[in-house]
Interface confidence: low
């Protein structure tokens, strides 16, 4: 059987490197090798590239190398497939080298802002050495912010006579690092160069973009003053590199601006001590170039009734995220504040918060939270300047078995009964939600029995024991990940009941 006719011939001219053709034969029943016949120098010369029948058989590709590559030129190419039964020839194909030329990428040597011109970067590059001198080159400039995965592109051309290998990229974000990469091609070619090595540049700094502001209301003190912990951070969308020199805070009771007090700080948190009335708090950040827009917060009066609109909340885990969803009876509320912090026996060391808009769910990457730690998560509805009642839940991103089992003791030992009590495991050692306790008990040389009780039970009365018998007993606390036994205790039932 003759070999299949070679089809889908595709050729590319890697400028001053090689001229390579590939093709796609159908699956061959028998061993096949190929010859590529070429005419070049505008038909003046001919040669053959062969995939011989020993080492290169069945490789549907051949390359012609310098010095037999001439440019500019038109080539004629025909591929022959050969096996033991004969030869099958492709259609003749024609190739203009200018249309299939691929050149080296350019080299970006600087990406810089221009003094006084905001939100612009000037890119300078070196035209590839291996590129035809007389040719107009077309370029694609790819750029992205340094922490983004998504590239944007802009296309332009440069005449060889320009000699000005620069491009001004405008309408960027202020004080942001951008990654740039550039490719080029002869204007007539369908093949682009590879991308240049990436280069980073930073746009000029401006006044701060803005702040997100939040608070924690603490119980009123004996003297009636209310501690309010203010906290703020760069607003979502602010340049990553933005740094504030400091923050100005001013606050006053509602309708009483002449009692305005001001504070300057370099921290991103500040504790205020307010009276029982409604207060308004304003914060701006500033740098050497100016101030941010004002962030405003209303602190409700001590006796103000806060609205309640969250009806239910669920926390669930996906493969790499914790997702919190809530249901609300107030369709007009479209902003929510989420707080989360570890539930520990002592004062929490880390407290985090984030605003959510136009959604009733919040997600966080699992790796931003510690495994085996319980987190308190609260969601506050925010309607204009009013903050409603929070709804809270708890979640683990990963449960483990408890680090310690319950400390157990035997009380009220009788003839056939005993009351077992145990202490709750400290929060830091639970490593998950305790879902139940299992009491394992065994008479000396006897069979082991067990009884499982709910996690809210810390005492259990065992009955139907044997009189005057030594028992060993331990209580296991279990999470979804498994259980951990507490200390083993021993007791002996009485021989006669004691009144």
């Amino acid at each position: 059987v003759l070999p299949a006719k070679p089809e889908n011939i595709s050729c590319i001219f890697y400028y001053e490197e090689n001229f390579t053709c590939t093709w796609s034969p159908e699956k061959e029943a028998s061993y096949t090798w190929y010859k590529v016949k070429r005419t070049y120098s505008y038909g003046y010369k001919s040669d053959i590239c062969s995939t011989d029948n020993s080492t290169r058989g069945n490789h549907a590709s051949c390359s012609f190398l310098p010095p037999t590559i001439t440019n500019p030129d038109n080539y004629t190419i025909q591929v022959e497939a050969q096996n033991a039964d004969g030869i099958m020839k492709s259609d003749i194909t024609y190739w203009n080298l200018d249309a299939i030329m691929k050149i080296e990428p350019p080299e970006i040597f600087s990406v810089k802002s221009v003094l006084g011109i905001k939100r612009m970067l000037q890119i300078k590059w070196i035209r590839p050495v291996l590129a035809p001198h007389s040719s107009t080159l077309k370029y694609t400039l790819r750029f992205r912010t340094i922490n983004s995965a998504y590239w944007m592109e802009v296309n332009f051309t440069k005449e060889d006579i320009d000699r000005d290998e620069t491009y001004n990229l405008t309408e960027l974000q202020a004080f942001t690092e951008y990654v740039m990469t550039l490719r080029c091609a002869p204007a007539e070619s369908m093949f682009w160069s590879g991308w240049s090595q990436e280069k980073v540049g930073t746009t000029e700094e401006e006044a701060p973009y803005g702040l997100d502001l939040w608070r924690v209301l603490k119980p009123a003190m004996v003297d009636g003053r209310r501690p309010v912990q203010l906290m703020w951070k760069k607003a979502t969308g602010a340049p990553v590199l933005e740094k504030a020199l400091g923050y100005n805070i001013w606050y006053f009771p509602e309708n009483n601006t002449n009692l305005t007090e001001t504070v300057n700080t370099t921290n991103q948190t500040h504790e205020l001590y307010l009276g029982g009335k409604t207060y308004w708090v304003y914060v701006v950040s500033y740098n050497s170039l100016g101030e941010s827009p004002v962030a405003t917060l209303r602190i409700p009066a001590l006796n103000e009734k806060t609205f309640q609109c969250i009806e239910a909340m669920q926390a669930c885990l996906t493969q790499d995220q914790l997702v919190v969803e809530w249901q609300s009876s107030a369709p007009e509320v479209d902003t929510w504040m989420v707080e989360w912090f570890p539930d520990v026996d002592s004062e929490p060391s880390s407290f985090s918060w984030e605003s959510v808009s136009q959604a009733r769910n919040w997600t966080i990457q699992k790796d931003e939270l510690k495994p085996l730690w319980c987190y308190n998560i609260s969601v506050y509805p925010v309607l204009r300047d009013r903050v409603g009642q929070p709804y809270s839940t708890q979640a683990y991103v990963q449960e483990g078995i408890p680090s310690a089992g319950p400390v157990t003791q035997a009380d009220s030992i009788g003839v056939k009964t005993v009351t077992i009590t145990w202490k709750e495991i400290p929060k830091s050692k639970r490593n998950g939600f305790i879902k139940n306790y299992t009491i394992f008990y065994q008479a000396e040389d006897g069979k082991e029995f067990s009884k499982t009780v709910n996690s809210n039970i810390l005492q259990y009365r065992l009955e139907s024991l044997t009189r005057r018998t030594s028992y060993s007993l331990q209580v296991m606390a279990s999470t979804n990940a498994g259980g951990t036994n507490g200390t083993k205790i021993n007791f002996k039932t009485l021989s006669i009941s004691v009144l």
Epitope: E7, N8, S24, P25, E26, S54, T55
Partner: antibody
């Protein structure tokens, strides 16, 4: 039968040099890429260097860059690793490995795609760098 | 360089039970350039899986691979005694090529 036989491993002082050789048999040598991979005693695998079937260097691990050189002699079916300025942390079993074009699942159309993977390993030769 | 992190570092499995090894790359790796090897005690490594999910010739269909981007997984559907050894993932996508630190699989 496909075989890779390494030689040249020895005890050498820090700062010294060594040349490892790997002789291949049982396959058409110049159709394949070759790599050197090392394994320090009781430790994991570390790719050292590779050379493609055309004789182009694939690259070097950062730890050996500028000190080690890979080369091949297709006529002798041999790949070499020239190791200079040796350090104690270069102590390891050095494996020679063949990189073969293995076909992944068809990606559509009439084209088939092949990529190079290490599919055959030698038994290794021990290099000890110690004073 | 691309850092490959394997978890767990050791695994003790009863015969007939499934096992799973995770390999996480510090940056995205093309799935065609992700490979798994097994090094049995006292032996040279051997190729198990190439291109993330293709089994090498002669490898039991108990072994399977999956994943993309930065997260890849090797699964053994039913562990047998002959599967004991250290399993390594390796990326070929970016230079230098890098291995994971290895996962030791033992039989309970």
């Amino acid at each position: 039968e496909v075989q890779l036989v390494e030689s040249g491993g020895d005890l050498v002082k820090p700062g010294g040099s060594l040349r490892l050789s790997c002789v291949a048999s049982g396959f058409t040598f110049d159709d394949y890429g070759m790599s050197w991979v090392r394994q320090a005693p009781g430790k994991g695998l570390q790719w050292v260097s590779g050379i493609n079937w055309a004789g182009g260097t694939i690259g070097y691990a950062d730890a050996v860059k500028g000190r080690f050189t890979i080369s091949r002699d297709n006529a002798r079916n041999t790949v070499y690793l020239q190791m200079n300025s040796l350090r104690a942390e270069d102590t390891a079993v050095y494996y020679c490995a063949r990189e073969s074009p293995l076909r992944l699942g068809d990606l559509g159309g009439d084209y088939f795609y092949y990529y190079y993977y290490i599919d055959v390993w030698g038994q290794g030769t021990l290099v000890t760098v110690s004073s | 360089e691309v850092v490959m992190i394997q978890t767990p570092l050791s695994l003790s499995v009863s015969p007939g039970e499934p096992a799973s090894i995770s390999c996480r790359a510090s940056q995205s790796v093309s799935s065609r350039y992700l490979v798994w090897y097994l090094q049995k005690p006292g032996q040279s490594p051997q190729l198990l899986i190439y291109g993330t999910s293709s089994r090498a010739t002669g490898v039991s269909d108990r072994f399977s691979g999956s994943g993309s981007g930065t997260d890849f997984t090797l699964r053994i559907s039913r562990v047998e005694a002959e599967d004991v050894g250290v399993y390594y993932c390796q990326q070929y996508d970016q230079s230098p090529r890098t291995f994971g630190q290895g996962t030791k699989v033992e039989i309970k």
